[in-house]
Interface confidence: medium
């Protein structure tokens, strides 16, 4: 109970934190926190490489989809946004920025354009797109 | 610095929290936290009254839109969901569950159907709908 009181004072809360409630994060200021992952949607359109650089400059990466359960907030995302998925022409696989391979059944890949990068679209779809085309993008930071 | 160390241990963090990072909440477990407000999207379709009751049972209310800046994550919400906005036939105004009047220029109200309740749709649109029609809904809890 003491730690709850401490947290209340630390965060200028004057009420007890119910046991069913919890803090999320830590995340960069004004990012979305969900199941202890941090997300931010960026309105300005950049190509994939610029989007990746923007996320990296904020100590984050482009969106990585790793779990439909832990990331079910992504179901309801409107429009199309760069994520950290790229096509490796040599072996035909899709992999994330960290080098891990796209797990089966996580995303439905739809070939809308010519390209080696992927846009995230609602309901866990990946739309293939030319990496040099400007699009909005999603950065993600996984908390430790 | 001590409080950061304390928080690290409390949240099983083994790294320092950068000064630019912060915790969000508190929120009910597995809710979305953004700018210290808590949101949850519910998939099951209920009429407006059932949706309101569902939110209340979780110590929350149906979505209240009060600021485009503080709630800009709502821009990217796909589909249509009940929010806590109702039409008062006696004076023709739209008001929130807490009795406050809808501020001008916050929502674009679109008359899709005859009704006294409103669905939230992306980019700060409100669609008038019959309150007895089942729809998905958004609950919101404002932290103190």
């Amino acid at each position: 109970i003491w730690s709850a009181v401490f947290l209340n004072s630390l965060f200028n809360q004057e009420v007890q934190i119910p046991l069913t409630e919890s803090y999320c994060g830590p995340c960069p200021k004004n990012w979305i926190c969900y199941k202890n992952n941090c997300y931010q949607f960026f309105n300005e359109s950049k190509n994939w490489y610029e989007s990746q650089a923007s996320c990296m400059s904020q100590n984050a990466s482009l969106l990585k989809v790793y779990s439909k359960e832990d990331q079910d907030l992504l179901k309801l995302v409107k429009s199309y946004h760069w994520m950290g998925l790229v096509h490796i022409p040599t072996n035909g696989s899709w992999q994330w920025e960290d080098g891990s391979i796209l797990s089966p059944n996580l995303l439905t890949i739809i070939e809308m354009q010519k390209g080696d990068c992927a846009l995230y679209a609602s309901s866990f779809k990946g739309y293939i797109e030319n990496c040099s085309i400007p699009n909005t993008y999603i950065c993600m930071q996984r908390t430790v | 610095i001590w409080s950061a160390v304390f928080l690290n241990s409390l949240f099983n963090q083994e790294v320092q929290i950068p000064l630019t990072e912060s915790y969000c909440g508190p929120c009910p477990k597995n809710w979305i936290c953004y700018k210290n407000n808590c949101y949850q999207f519910f998939n099951e379709s209920k009429n407006w009254y059932e949706s309101q009751a569902s939110c209340m049972s979780q110590n929350a209310s149906l979505l209240k839109v009060y600021s485009k800046e503080d709630q800009d994550l709502l821009k990217l919400v796909k589909s249509y969901h009940w929010m806590g906005l109702v039409h008062i036939p006696t004076n023709g105004s739209w008001q929130w569950e807490d009795g406050s009047i809808l501020s001008p220029n916050l929502l674009t109200i679109i008359e899709m159907q005859k009704g006294d309740c409103a669905l939230y749709a992306s980019s700060f649109k409100g669609y008038i709908e019959n309150c007895s029609i089942p729809n998905t809904y958004i609950c919101m809890q404002r932290t103190v």
């Epitope: 429009s79 199309y80 439905t108 890949i109 739809i110 070939e111 809308m112 354009q113 010519k114 390209g115 846009l119 679209a121 609602s122 309901s123 779809k125 739309y127 293939i128 797109e129 030319n130 040099s132 085309i133 699009n135 | 589909s79």
Partner: antibody
Amino acid sequence: QVTLKESGPTLVKPTQTLTLTCTFSGFSLSTSGVGVGWIRQPPGKALEWLALIYWDDDKRYSPSLESRLTITKDTSKNQVVLTMTNMDPVDTATYYCAHRTGIAVAGIAFDIWGQGTMVTVSS
Amino acid sequence: QSVLTQPPSVSVSPGQTASITCSGDKLGDKYVSWYQQKPGQSPVLVIYQDTKRPSGIPERFSGSNSGNTATLTISGTQTVDEADYYCQAWDSSSLYVFGTGTKVTVL
């Protein structure tokens, strides 16, 4: 063999809501990658895409008409329904539904079209 | 919103080659489909993904796409090819976009 057929009113009054039904056969709208779209064509004019619904109930709308359109599906009945509110004489057109080609193959093409239904908006 | 521009009409003699162009910003970066529509009939897909022909479409129909222009070519044009032709592409802002349409007349 994939077939689609549109049905609905031939005459609608201005400000009314149009409801069109596309009944299809030869495929299932629960199969991954499948989609059904609506396209219209005013007399003597070009085709205009309106909306599309995917197998997983994900919906896409023409940005210029999004506020007026709703697309839904009934997988058990093999039907897709399009509603368009606040009809205006400029919405007079032939309305087609079409099958979107399968996953990762010609993702942007509509390979099979219905016969179309002519809708006139007039008072 | 994206705009795909086509010439309003193209005339060709039987047996000759008809070329229909479709212009749009960086169109070569996108996949283009082509549809044929005869009077009073529904559109029929004749080319998808720039160059591919659905089954049942004659070999005289071919497509190409680079730069800002996609082209539908009808080699050895026949009178049955007289129709309106529409190009179509997709992008993440306008989604599915159709061209302005070209009327092909076989003289």
